[in-house]
């Protein structure tokens, strides 16, 4: 056997090159046949009407032909025939790769509530061979379940991802990524998750800045409530008591002027949205006003030591020297 060919793999729409090579040439007629055994080239002449076949080289040692705009129907065995005595035949297999025509991501619900499990589907249509689908939530790879449907030598792959959503997932992309031999680089499609979650409530003491509340001082607390949808109602209540008469409520802010010991207690900020409600508590303890030290009567040199005390709002409810905030979700 001195007739040689090589198999060819080509992407649909591109160019395949078929080469029939003769090692020891004796000027015998060489021809190239298609999978239906129709003659494409007889020596350097193309009797076949398909003008996508073009002669690249013809010599006593090679018949080289290009096939442009390859389609899936071109796939199969192409025969090189050499009319020696006895005749020789060799075949080359053209394999046509078809990238997925369409990549669609479909999310069960546009908006999900935290804690829910949602179904996300990704479909890669009409590829050959079947496409591999990978899932990512942000940068984290997730495992989906794929189903392959074959039709007319083409494959449609649908991958299903069951995803339990958390509030941190809001705005995070769910990415369907395709791996296919006919696709170079990244072919992907994505949808951004929209996750609704109940409010997270935080109380911030905006006055006094140093955090120590004394009689006669003013107190200002700001309630920050973040949720999706954004809470429409933010309310202040005093736990187990009436709100002081001199307390002023202005949206998320609570002002109490001229603090006195009767203002001691737990102040609660409550926020709600369609998902649920939550609150955070602030325990107010009003300290005695500072005592004034009389000026010295003798002329002496004194060294003043300034002690800076950093006060921290803590998140438990122990009775201490400063007010404390406790956040509670309901």
């Amino acid at each position: 056997q001195n007739l040689f060919t090589k198999d060819v793999t080509v992407i649909e729409g591109e160019v395949a090159t078929i080469s029939c090579q003769v090692n020891k040439s004796d000027d015998s007629v060489i021809q190239l046949l298609n999978p239906n055994r129709q003659t494409i080239y007889f020596r350097d002449f193309r009797p076949l009407k398909d003008s996508r076949f073009q002669l690249l080289n013809f010599s006593s040692s090679e018949l080289k032909v290009s096939l442009t705009n390859v389609s899936i129907s071109d796939e199969g065995r192409y025969f090189c025939q050499l009319y020696t005595d006895p005749p020789q035949e060799s075949y080359t297999t053209i394999t046509v790769l078809v990238p997925p025509r369409n990549l669609m991501i479909d999310i069960q619900r546009d908006t999900a509530v935290e804690g829910e499990e949602i179904e996300v589907n990704c479909t890669a249509m009409a590829s050959k061979p079947a496409t591999t689908i990978r899932w990512f939530k942000g940068n984290t790879e997730l495992k989906g379940k794929s189903e392959v449907e074959e039709w007319s030598d083409m494959y449609t792959v649908t991958s299903q991802l069951m995803l339990k959503v958390h509030k941190e997932d809001d705005g995070v992309p769910v990415i369907c990524q395709v791996e296919h031999p006919a696709v170079t680089g990244n072919l992907q499609t994505q949808r951004y998750l929209e996750v609704q979650y109940k409010p997270q409530v935080h109380i911030q003491m905006t006055y006094p800045l140093q955090g120590l509340t004394r009689e006669g001082d003013a107190l200002e607390l700001t309630c920050e409530a973040i949720g999706k949808p954004q809470p429409v109602m933010v309310t202040w209540v005093r736990v187990d008591d009436e709100m002081p008469q001199h307390a002023v409520l202005s949206g998320p802010n609570l002002f109490i002027n001229n603090l006195n010991k009767t203002d001691n207690g737990t102040y609660r900020c409550e926020a709600s949205n369609i998902v649920g409600k939550a609150h955070s508590d602030y325990m107010l303890y009003v300290y005695d006003p500072p005592t004034t030290i009389p000026p010295p009567t003798t002329t002496t040199t004194t060294t003043t030591t300034t002690t800076t005390t950093i006060l921290t709002i803590i998140t438990d409810s122990r009775a201490g020297e400063e007010g404390s905030i406790r956040a509670v979700d309901h």
Epitope: D26, S28, Q38, F42, R43, F45, Y83, T84, D85, P86
Partner: antibody, heavy 116, light 109 residues
Framework: EVQLVESGGGLVKPGGSLRLSCAAS????????MSWVRQAPGKGLEWVSA????????YYADSVKGRFTISRDNSKNTLYLQMNSLRAEDTALYYC?????????WGRGTLVTVSS | SSELTQDPAVSVALGQTVRITCQGD??????ASWYQQKPGQAPVLVIY???NRLSGIPDRFSGSSSGNTASLTITGAQAEDEADYYC???????????FGGGTKLTVLG
């Protein structure tokens, strides 16, 4: 000069045999497939048989299969057609032609008459 | 076996254009070749492939193909074009040659 010259035709009785020859000159004979084409008096062209350049592959029309044998001697640049069991309907002018898929060179023909 | 069908006879006025057609299933895949044969002479290849003329053939001869029909067109027919015209192709295997029945072209005037 590039040419083909047929010979060997004549009058033969039904059931008889005849061997036609075609001498080629002016081109590399072994590089080309060759065919025999015949034409009955007042009729159209009919392909009879073909042979590859090396002689390794042969093809026949259904009407002559089993009765005719095509061969070649590349050292003599000669094509042959051995015709056995001849019938009246084999009466025709027999042309040899260079087969490039299309027939780009023809001889003048040799007449075969099958008659009792 | 494959068959090629031609009109038995066609006539054309001198200097006019004439088209000779050839029909057959094999022509869906393969180009036809066209041969001119004058009385008492061997056939001569006129057109082969998509529209290739053998050297020495006037450019008034051209070939075309559509579907299962091949056509030979003579643009500005001359008296010397009067002859029998045969189309030929191969069967689908490419191993068996088939000829049309031939068309007798008469040039009038």
């Amino acid at each position: 000069e590039v040419q083909l010259v047929e010979s060997g035709g004549g009058l033969v009785k039904p059931g008889g045999s005849l061997r036609l020859s075609c001498a080629a000159s002016g081109f590399t004979f072994s590089s080309y497939a060759m065919s025999w084409v015949r034409q009955a008096p007042g009729k159209g062209l009919e392909w009879v048989s073909a042979i590859s350049g090396s002689g390794g592959s042969t093809y026949y029309a259904d009407s002559v299969k089993g009765r005719f044998t095509i061969s070649r001697d590349n050292s003599k640049n000669t094509l042959y057609l051995q015709m056995n069991s001849l019938r009246a309907e084999d009466t025709a002018l027999y042309y040899c032609a260079r087969d490039n898929w299309y027939f780009d060179l023809w001889g003048r023909g040799t007449l075969v008459t099958v008659s009792s | 076996s494959s068959e090629l069908t031609q009109d038995p006879a066609v006539s054309v006025a001198l200097g006019q254009t004439v088209r000779i057609t050839c029909q057959g299933d094999s022509l869906r895949s393969y180009y036809a070749s066209w041969y001119q044969q004058k009385p008492g002479q061997a056939p001569v290849l006129v057109i082969y492939g998509k529209n290739n003329r053998l050297s020495g053939i006037p450019d008034r001869f051209s070939g075309s193909s559509s579907g299962n029909t091949a056509s030979l067109t003579i643009t500005g027919a001359q008296a010397e074009d009067e002859a029998d015209y045969y189309c030929n192709s191969r069967d689908s295997s490419g191993n068996h040659v088939v000829f049309g029945g031939g068309t007798k072209l008469t040039v009038l005037g």
